[in-house]
C-alpha cells in the first residue's frame, strides 16, 4: 500500500538537491581560498539536518545553527548590497564591482540560491513532490527559514555604509513583506551602519521620474530614520549604462547622471 | 550650484518675533533636508532644527516651545519662525543642506544673516 | 543632552607641521562625527563625517580617526590657508551637539 503523503502548495525540491549542494560547496570553496578549509560533506550533512525527519511548517533557526556554525565567513562589512525584487541587477553588479558582496556571493547564499528543499516528519525522505508555500501552508518552511536565519545575519555583520537596489518597475518599490523589509532592514545595527544607501533601478527608457518620491521609499526613509539610521536615495535611471559605467568608470558618458 | 541664502535678519525689541527665510537653488528640497544652526557673537555653534524633506522636523528641547521650521517646496525656501525673542537669541543663523536625503550633517552652508535682539 | 569637548581650545604651529585636534563626548556616538572648519567671517565648511570619512574636495593632509567617545582631527602638514576654527559635530542623538571649537593659527 502507498504511503500517504501530504501535498503542499509548492513546488517540490530542487532535482538532485543533494548532489547540487555539494557540487556547489565544492566549487565556491575552490574559488574562494578563505573558504578552502570548509569541509563539504560536513556542509551538506548539517543542511540535511536542519530539515530531515522534521515536519516542514516547524522548523526553526534553531536547526540551520549547526550550518550557520560551518559556513562562518568574514566579509568586508562595508561592502554589502542588499536587493529586493531585483535579484539578477544586483548579482550581476557584484561581479563588476568584485568588492561588494550580495548575500548570494557569500557560501551559504550561493549553495542556497533558486532551490527549493524540504523533508517529511519522522522519515529521511526528502519530499520532490511538494513543500510548502509560505502564503498557502506556512511561514516556518524550510526554505522561508533558512533565508530569514541567514539574512538576519547578514544584515548584523554590515557596517558603514550599505547599498540596497530596489526594483523601481513594481507597485511597491519598498516592500514591508519581502525579505528586505522584513528581515534586514531591522537587523542593521545602528551602533556599526551610519548610513542605508536606496538605488532605485527604473525600468522603462523614458521613465524620468523621481521614484525616491515614492511614498513606499518615504516609508523606508522613516522606518531606517527612526533606527537612527541615516537614509539617502538615489535613482539609476540606466540600468544598463549604471553597469556599464561601473565596468568602464572613465568613459566620458558616465559622468551625467546614470 | 548648489546654494543656500539666508534673509530676514536684522534687529527687533525682546519679547517681538522675527521669520527667516534660507531660499535653496541647485537642488530641491523634495530631496535633501536642511538644518538651521546658530552662532552668537564669538561662541561656538548650537543646532536649532531641521525640516526633513517630507516635512517632518526635528528641534533642540531649547528652541520647541519658541521656534517652528517649517517650508514652501514651490518656493524651494525653508524658513525659521521666532517668536518671545530674548536678548540671548542674538546671533548668527545659517542655514545649512544635508549631504544625503536624511542625514545629521552639512555639506553646503549659507552666509548666515545676524539676529539682533535688543531694546 | 550629549557635551562634546575639543582640546586645546586654541594653538599655534609652524607651516609644515602635524597638528592634532581631541574631542571627547560624554557618551559612546560610535562613528557619529563630523568636523568642521570656519573661517573668521564665513560659514563652516564639512571636512570630515563619519569620524573618518573625508568630504569631496577636502585636501588629503586632513584626516580623522577614533570611534565610541574619543576622536582626533590631524593635519598631517599645516599650511597658511588653515588658520581657522575647527568644531566636531555629534550626530549620534538629538539635540545635535558641537564642541566649542579649537582655534588654530600660524606661529
Known amino acids: 500500500v502507498p504511503r500517504w503523503r501530504q501535498q503542499w502548495s509548492g513546488p517540490g525540491t530542487t532535482k538532485r538537491f543533494p548532489e547540487t549542494v555539494l557540487a556547489r560547496c565544492v566549487k565556491y570553496t575552490e574559488i574562494h581560498p578563505e573558504m578552502r578549509h570548509v569541509d563539504c560533506q560536513s556542509v551538506w550533512d548539517a543542511f540535511k539536518g536542519a530539515f530531515i525527519s522534521k515536519h516542514p511548517c516547524n522548523i526553526t533557526e534553531e536547526d540551520y545553527q549547526p550550518l550557520m556554525k560551518l559556513g562562518t565567513q568574514t566579509v568586508p562589512c562595508n561592502k554589502i548590497l542588499l536587493w529586493s525584487r531585483i535579484k539578477d541587477l544586483a548579482h550581476q553588479f557584484t561581479q563588476v564591482q568584485r568588492d561588494m558582496f550580495t548575500l548570494e556571493d557569500t557560501l551559504l547564499g550561493y549553495l542556497a540560491d533558486d532551490l527549493t528543499w524540504c523533508g517529511e516528519f519522522n522519515t529521511s525522505k526528502i519530499n520532490y513532490q511538494s513543500c510548502p508555500d509560505w502564503r498557502k501552508d506556512c511561514s516556518n518552511n524550510p526554505v522561508s527559514v533558512f533565508w530569514k536565519t541567514v539574512s538576519r545575519r547578514f544584515a548584523e555583520a554590515a557596517c558603514d555604509v550599505v547599498h540596497v537596489m530596489l526594483n523601481g518597475s513594481r507597485s511597491k518599490i519598498f516592500d514591508k513583506n519581502s525579505t528586505f523589509g522584513s528581515v534586514e532592514v531591522h537587523n542593521l545595527q545602528p551602533e556599526k551602519v551610519q548610513t542605508l544607501e536606496a538605488w532605485v533601478i527604473h525600468g522603462g527608457r523614458e521613465d524620468s521620474r523621481d521614484l525616491c518620491q515614492d511614498p513606499t521609499i518615504k516609508e523606508l526613509e522613516s522606518i531606517i530614520s527612526k533606527r537612527n539610521i541615516q537614509f539617502s536615495c538615489k535613482n539609476i535611471y540606466r540600468p544598463d549604462k549604471f553597469l556599464q559605467c561601473v565596468k568602464n568608470p572613465e568613459d566620458s558618458s558616465c559622468t551625467s547622471e546614470i | 550650484q548648489v546654494q543656500l541664502v539666508e534673509s530676514g535678519g536684522g534687529v527687533v525689541q525682546p519679547g517681538r518675533s522675527l521669520r527667516l527665510s534660507c531660499a535653496a537653488s541647485g537642488f530641491s528640497l523634495t530631496n535633501y533636508g536642511v538644518h538651521w544652526v546658530r552662532q552668537a557673537p564669538g561662541k561656538g555653534l548650537e543646532w536649532v532644527a531641521v525640516?526633513?524633506?517630507?516635512?517632518?522636523?526635528d528641534y533642540s528641547a531649547a528652541f520647541m516651545s519658541r521656534f517652528t521650521i517649517s517650508k514652501d517646496n514651490s518656493k524651494n525656501t525653508v524658513y525659521l519662525q521666532m517668536n518671545s525673542l530674548r536678548a540671548e537669541d542674538t546671533a548668527v543663523y545659517y542655514c545649512a543642506k544635508t549631504t544625503l536625503t536624511r542625514v545629521w550633517y552639512c555639506d553646503v552652508w549659507g552666509q548666515g544673516t545676524l539676529v539682533t535682539v535688543s531694546s | 543632552d550629549i557635551q562634546m569637548t575639543q582640546s586645546p581650545s586654541s594653538l599655534s604651529a609652524s607651516v609644515g607641521d602635524r597638528v592634532t585636534i581631541t574631542c571627547k563626548s560624554s557618551?559612546?556616538?560610535?562613528?557619529?562625527l563630523a568636523w568642521y572648519q570656519q573661517k573668521p567671517g564665513k560659514a563652516p565648511k564639512l571636512l570630515i563625517y563619519g569620524a573618518t570619512s573625508l568630504e569631496t574636495g577636502v585636501p588629503s593632509r586632513f584626516s580623522g580617526s577614533g570611534s565610541g567617545t574619543d576622536f582626533t582631527l590631524t593635519i598631517s602638514s599645516l599650511q597658511p590657508e588653515d588658520v581657522a576654527t575647527y568644531y566636531c559635530?555629534?550626530?549620534?542623538?538629538?539635540?545635535?551637539?558641537f564642541g566649542q571649537g579649537t582655534k588654530v593659527e600660524i606661529k
Open positions: 525640516i526633513w524633506r517630507g516635512g517632518s522636523t
Open positions: 557618551e559612546d556616538i560610535y562613528n557619529r
Open positions: 559635530q555629534q550626530y549620534w542623538n538629538t539635540p545635535l551637539t
